[in-house]
């Protein structure tokens, strides 16, 4: 069981505390109420690329 | 076999106080979430409490904020609902259900239900 | 709160028949609707999962579809066993969830 703060979700997920596990971020557009979203919110996708160096 | 076998209901008087268990077989407890529905007699489904894989995190309806209080003993393959200040509309059918393993999309097994009546 | 509302009440069939009930989602809840079956006495038992997934063990005579606000859990042809109460359960916004007030499929 993960303690939340210790282990990282890897990047595109994030921890969901009603799952107990890392969930996949690109299901939040589909649903955004789910409390895994929120860290999302802060965190840039998978796919995510900087535009300058 | 999956199996949810809850105890637990009774008559009680208005005020009053109730421990619901939900005793779990059949299958690996720990993994999944769980939630408490009730039914009031004759009428439909509502959802009553939601807990987490490992107890962390618990939601409630509106309707037993601050009265009802939902645990689980993973040790013990046990889910349980506490009630107090129980009032004549908590009367109902009382089902423990079990989420889906991947997400709480939804409730694949249901126990068989327990009886709750308040009056006095 | 999300409400979930069915149609029909209830609704009398006869044995073979094709019966159809609908449920209505007050915004849009995208696929995240389930559907449960309840004999007297009974727990309610899963039926259809996510809009049109058949839960394991479930006859193919029941399919469900829809997405978005509208949705529909069709019995293909009627068996004595189906004559149940029939709900729809939204998981869009879970774990908090809602139902639907239920649809009663009487003998005709």
């Known amino acids: 069981e993960r303690v939340p703060g210790t282990t990282p979700c890897s990047r595109g997920s994030s921890w969901s505390a009603d799952l107990d596990k890392c969930m996949d971020c690109a299901s939040c557009p589909a649903r955004p109420h789910s409390d895994f979203c929120l860290g999302c919110a802060a965190a840039p996708p998978a796919s995510f690329r900087l535009l300058w160096p | 076999e999956v199996q949810l076998l809850e105890s637990g209901g009774g008559l009680v008087q208005p005020g009053g106080s109730l421990r619901l268990s939900c005793a779990a077989s059949?299958?690996?407890?720990?993994?999944?979430?769980m939630i408490w529905v009730r039914q009031a007699p004759g009428k439909g489904l509502e959802w009553v409490s939601y807990?987490?894989?490992?107890?962390?995190?618990?939601h409630y309806a509106d309707s037993v904020k601050g009265r009802f209080t939902i645990s689980r003993d993973n040790s013990k393959n046990t889910l349980y609902l506490q009630m107090n200040s129980l009032r004549a509309e908590d009367t109902a059918v009382y089902y423990c259900?079990?989420?889906?393993?991947?997400?709480?999309?939804?409730?694949?097994?249901w126990g068989q239900g327990t009886l709750v009546t308040v009056s006095s | 709160d999300i409400q979930m509302t069915q149609s029909p009440s209830s609704l009398s069939a006869s044995v073979g028949d094709r019966v159809t009930i609908t449920c209505r989602a007050s915004?849009?809840?995208?696929?995240?609707l389930n559907w449960y079956q309840q004999k007297p006495g009974k727990a309610p038992k899963l039926l259809i999962y996510?809009?049109?997934s058949l839960q394991s063990g479930v006859p193919s005579r029941f399919s469900g579809s829809g997405s978005g606000t509208d949705f529909t859990l069709t019995i293909s042809s009627l068996q004595p066993e189906d004559f149940a109460t029939y709900y729809c359960?939204?998981?869009?916004?879970?774990?908090?969830?809602?139902f639907g007030q239920g649809t009663k499929v009487e003998i005709k």
């Open positions: 259900a079990r989420g889906g393993d991947t997400y709480f999309d939804y409730f694949d097994y």
């Open positions: 059949g299958f690996t407890f720990s993994p999944y979430p």
């Open positions: 807990i987490s894989p490992s107890g962390g995190s618990t």
């Open positions: 915004q849009s809840i995208s696929g995240y």
């Open positions: 996510q809009a049109s």
């Open positions: 359960q939204q998981s869009y916004t879970s774990p908090f969830i809602t």
